[in-house]
Amino acid sequence: QDPYVKEAENLKKYFNAGHSDVADNGTLFLGILKNWKEESDRKIMQSQIVSFYFKLFKNFKDDQSIQKSVETIKEDMNVKFFNSNKKKRDDFEKLTNYSVTDLNVQRKAIHELIQVMAELSPAAKTGKRKRSQMLFRGRRASQ
Amino acid sequence: QDPYVKEAENLKKYFNAGHSDVADNGTLFLGILKNWKEESDRKIMQSQIVSFYFKLFKNFKDDQSIQKSVETIKEDMNVKFFNSNKKKRDDFEKLTNYSVTDLNVQRKAIHELIQVMAELSPAAKTGKRKRSQMLFRGRRASQ
């Protein structure tokens, strides 16, 4: 059994979240995750879900009684979602920490908008990546 | 030329974001996007970037002089990032709007944590999807 399970059960007790009434009015995340099977769609949704949990845990950072549980779960999220890749986790954290009301950040975001938009669709790859895809398709077709 | 380009240039003027000083202290998003080539990694990062822009645009929703530009850009983001899929966009918005300080939301999030965690790694697919992958691998191997 993964280490997070026991710690999540501990958090359930702490938040009184095992009661049947918690399930009233539908789910937050599970229903949405059911809607998306394609890996890249799932990553779009899971990215928001993971950042929600990180914010939630930050909110409770002063509650000593659940610190061990929170740290264990965060570590397990790191393994599962970021493949234990520190750089990936750090870049993600950077993005979640930008303040939408900081004028310097606002101006930088607008400055970068055209280039960000150009990269948004999966088709918008560098020439190199496009070429490697075509080669791959060619090999597949010739098998 | 995509419609967003002209409108993004308009926003640059409005935010005084064309100045060379805006680029001081590095980029917000572009440097991070350069780090990740794998499509699912890019989606993790782009998900945070798109939600940042949506929050930024919401912050400026009462500035009539840029409303047309903002709407055009949001629409283009919808096309590029969500493939014009309303359901995908709605699910995404739902996730970004959950309040981390709402007690009901906190309890639901903790209630769903174990199942969310179980689905985080790409390997964690339903039995059905695992089976179809194995069949596919089998076919590939026999080609």
């Epitope: 009301t101 | 935010f15 005084n16 929703k61 009462d62 500035d63």
Partner: nanobody
Framework: QVQLQDSGGGTVQAGGSLRLSCAAS????????VGWFRQAPGKEREFVAR????????SYANSVDGRFTVSTDNAKNTVYLQMNSLKPEDTAIYYC????????????????WGQGTQVTVSS
């Protein structure tokens, strides 16, 4: 003639709070953004925060983001700067300003200034 009347300054301990007010008169301001700037002794005047008169659309200097909140009361033609978790380095004269463009951090491009209100944060 546009007039900006700022008030609410004072002396406070580090960690304390103050609320500055700026009452505007002389025209309809709904399409404008109003800003707060500050000037510490021996330093240039610097941008602190801005907001559209109609509410929303807030921007802050990095040094105050998360501690200061700017808001407006349209009915009273007044803009407020709520300053929390004050630090000694926040000590300055604070000026209410009506900028010449909607987003400006450049004090040379401001049309109208309030007379300024002194904020002193002691450690």
């Amino acid at each position: 003639q546009v007039q900006l009347q700022d008030s609410g300054g004072g002396t406070v301990q580090a960690g304390g709070s103050l609320r500055l007010s700026c009452a505007a008169s002389g025209r309809t301001f709904s399409n404008y953004a109003v800003g707060w700037f500050r000037q510490a002794p021996g330093k240039e005047r610097e941008f602190v925060a801005r907001i559209k008169w109609s509410g929303g659309s807030r921007s802050y200097a990095n040094s105050v983001d998360g501690r200061f909140t700017v808001s407006t009361d349209n009915a009273k033609n007044t803009v407020y700067l709520q300053m929390n978790s004050l630090k000694p380095e926040d000590t300055a004269i604070y000026y209410c300003a009506l900028p010449s463009n909607i987003i400006t951090t450049d004090y040379l491009r401001v049309y109208y200034w309030g007379q300024g209100t002194q904020v002193t944060v002691s450690s």
